[in-house]
């Protein structure tokens, strides 16, 4: 039942308290734990107008809003150096590789007609190479790079016309790649698409301050996801036998005073208004959280009873993103009697309590380093060890059903509003070099060891 997550902050005795002996756990992850790593197409592919690719809203946003960035052409050039990415994956020894398909690389204007042959060939080659290496592909259909033509013609995700167009695109991907893909993600972190794309203007398309637009976009993203899930479930799952979800991202927050009921309410409200916004319709009762409906009654779209039924249960697992994009900006927290916290274990416990202990894939996790840091990324190792320790505790001590972990990211690349000022890769890439060699950082060696040992050995 929605609202159970509040027990996390009130330190309900049912929630395993973190005592000193549990600050670090030397143990292994479950047998067959799913270890992986991820990238987003726009962040690493480069070649933003090569071989017939159409422009995306982010290509446009870079040229209009990020004055110091020439284009994503800098990037890590994964479109050109696919073999180097595969070598990097081999080096780490992952069970899966999570990547996204660039919608405008397949369909330059977004509409599903004849696919761009070079784009199709690129993804097909990548999938074949992964299958050959026994690396499971987890494929994201939409990681923010909406074809610019759809933004210009329809107003992007504000227009519910996009729902059917997205479903057509998904259908094509299922038809062409579904024989090799067992895990699909429809949309990566829709909260950021809606909130920063249409609220703060920090993300493409860079629209600002229109609360109604923010919630219309969120509504259409949820409906698009649901439509694609039903499409896959009915027409593709019977013979492809795969799983499909949506990656939902969140921060975590702690009350200034854990004994203060109002502070705890505000923490719950904070989680509900970010994660619950999308999780409640999909993983919960099919509707927006009640608190949001009360708070936003005249700007929050309504789900009909039929739509609630349609939305509910449209994810085969809970794909969860916990990374820096959901922790920026930070400047409003103090006013609310709360502090942001990087406690992934508690966030996982909240999901367990709110959404009836779902199977969870951590679909994005990691931190960042300054762009000047090359291969000695000690901070990244510290953060990774901390996050992985929390995941292990969540599994072993709290009986949370985490079945996989996605380290983010395979490569240094374009980091959205931060462009190239930060790095998130386990492999260092010199963006100014011609060959864009992938050099393993200390974190890559560390993650490789974790995977090899399936956890932390004494």
């Amino acid at each position: 039942f929605s609202g159970d997550g509040r027990a996390i902050w009130s330190k309900n005795p049912n929630f395993t308290p973190v005592n000193e002996s549990q600050l670090f756990l030397y143990d292994t992850f479950p047998k067959n734990f799913f270890w992986g790593i991820g990238t987003g197409a726009l962040q690493v592919e480069g070649s933003w107008k090569k071989d017939g690719k159409g422009p995306s809203i982010w290509d446009h946003f870079i040229h209009t809003h990020l004055k110091n960035v020439s284009s994503t052409n800098g990037s890590s050039d994964s479109y050109i150096f696919l073999e180097k990415d595969l070598s990097a994956l081999d080096f780490i020894g992952v069970s899966f590789y999570q990547f996204s398909i660039s919608w405008p690389r397949l369909f330059p204007d977004g509409i599903v007609t004849v696919a761009n042959a070079k784009g199709l060939q690129y993804y097909s080659t990548l999938l074949d190479a992964l299958v050959l290496r026994n690396i499971e592909p987890i494929v994201t259909l939409y990681h923010w790079d909406l074809p610019l033509a759809l933004q210009e013609k329809y107003g992007g995700w504000k227009n519910d016309t996009i729902i059917d167009i997205f479903n057509d695109y998904a259908t094509y991907c299922f038809q062409m790649f579904g024989d090799r893909v067992k895990y699909w993600i429809t949309i990566h972190n829709p909260y950021l698409v809606a909130w920063h794309g249409y609220g703060t203007g920090m993300h493409a398309p860079g629209e600002k301050g229109n609360l109604a637009a923010v919630y219309t976009v969120g509504h259409n993203l949820i409906k698009a996801h649901s439509k694609v899930w039903h499409n896959y479930n009915t027409h593709f799952r019977p013979h492809q036998k795969g799983w499909l979800s949506i990656t939902l991202g969140s921060h975590w927050i702690e009350p200034n005073r854990s004994e203060n009921t109002m502070d705890i309410f505000k923490c719950q409200q904070s989680m509900v208004s970010v994660l619950g916004w999308f999780a409640n319709p999909i993983h919960g009762d099919g509707d927006y959280p009640e608190g949001m409906r009360k708070k936003l009654f005249s700007v929050l779209p309504i789900f009909s009873e039929a739509e609630k039924h349609e939305m509910r249960g449209t994810a085969d697992f809970f794909a969860f993103s916990f990374g820096p994009n959901n922790f920026k900006p930070l400047n409003t927290m103090a006013k609310m009697g709360q502090n942001v916290s990087l406690n992934l274990r508690e966030a996982l416990n909240w999901i367990k309590l709110e959404y009836n202990n779902p199977r969870i894939l951590i679909a994005e996790n990691g931190w960042f380093t300054d762009s000047r840091v090359k291969t000695e990324d000690t901070t990244a190792i510290y953060m990774m060890k901390n996050f992985l320790s929390q995941v292990l505790q969540a599994i072993r001590l709290d009986e949370i059903r985490v079945f996989g972990y996605t380290a983010w990211s395979l490569l240094d690349g374009f980091e959205w509003q931060d462009a190239y000022t930060i790095r998130r890769g386990l492999f260092y890439v010199d963006f100014n070099s011609k060959q864009k060699e992938r050099k393993p950082k200390s974190s890559a060696h560390y993650y490789k060891q974790i995977i090899r040992e399936n956890g932390f050995s004494l």
């Epitope: 609202g3 637009a213 219309t216 921060h251 409200q269 608190g291 708070k295 005249s298 700007v299 309504i302």
Partner: antibody, heavy 129, light 113 residues
Framework: QVQLVESGGGVVQPGRSLRLSCAAS????????MHWVRQAPGKGLEWVAV????????YYADSVKGRFTISRDNSKNTLYLQMNSLRAEDTAVFYC??????????????????????WGQGTTVTVSS | DIVLTQTPLSLPVTPGEPASISCRSS????????????LDWYLQKPGQSPQLLIY???YRASGVPDRFSGSGSGTDFTLKISRVEAEDVGVYYC?????????FGGGTKVEIK
Amino acid sequence: QVQLVESGGGVVQPGRSLRLSCAASGFNFSSYGMHWVRQAPGKGLEWVAVIWYDGSNKYYADSVKGRFTISRDNSKNTLYLQMNSLRAEDTAVFYCARDQYFDFWSGYPFFYYYGMDVWGQGTTVTVSS
Amino acid sequence: DIVLTQTPLSLPVTPGEPASISCRSSQSLLDSDDGDTYLDWYLQKPGQSPQLLIYTLSYRASGVPDRFSGSGSGTDFTLKISRVEAEDVGVYYCMQRIEFPLTFGGGTKVEIK
């Protein structure tokens, strides 16, 4: 500046109809929920109806349900109240008001509803035979 | 429907002195989901349209002087004016918005003695 201007009031016989309008200016009308509130002569405020930003949802006070219809035309930045089967007790000054939300764009979406932060000057409806 | 009862009906005040208006609800306005109390206060000055003073129990609307404050629990609420000024005269209304239909209190008329 942000402004709401009501019009359409007047004297009407019981059982007849009247349509009130509220013209909005100085803000993005299509992003806000809107209310009608009325005030009978010498009496207090009575909430009448609300409409969602896109017209998709509406609620009414029991006293007007089935007789009054709230609507909007976002292309014209105008809110309407269609009043049918008017009664003597509907005599009042009718105000339109904007629903405002706290814009917390600098961080996460915490929403503190502002209430009705902008009101029109009102238009008078007199129902009398 | 939720009934809001305001007291007193009329409140004669002396400039510079404090004033207090009470509003009682027939049911709780505390939302058990998010901990917020859905009560607002409005002021209608003579010959003018109403204006928002306080929203969600205790948050002052933009431009409202800090001499105004709202407080209360689930069913009992108070609007306080720490030092009344001549411009504060008018009718004060509480309003609930925890459920439809939204309802107003009957109003409290504040006038200078």
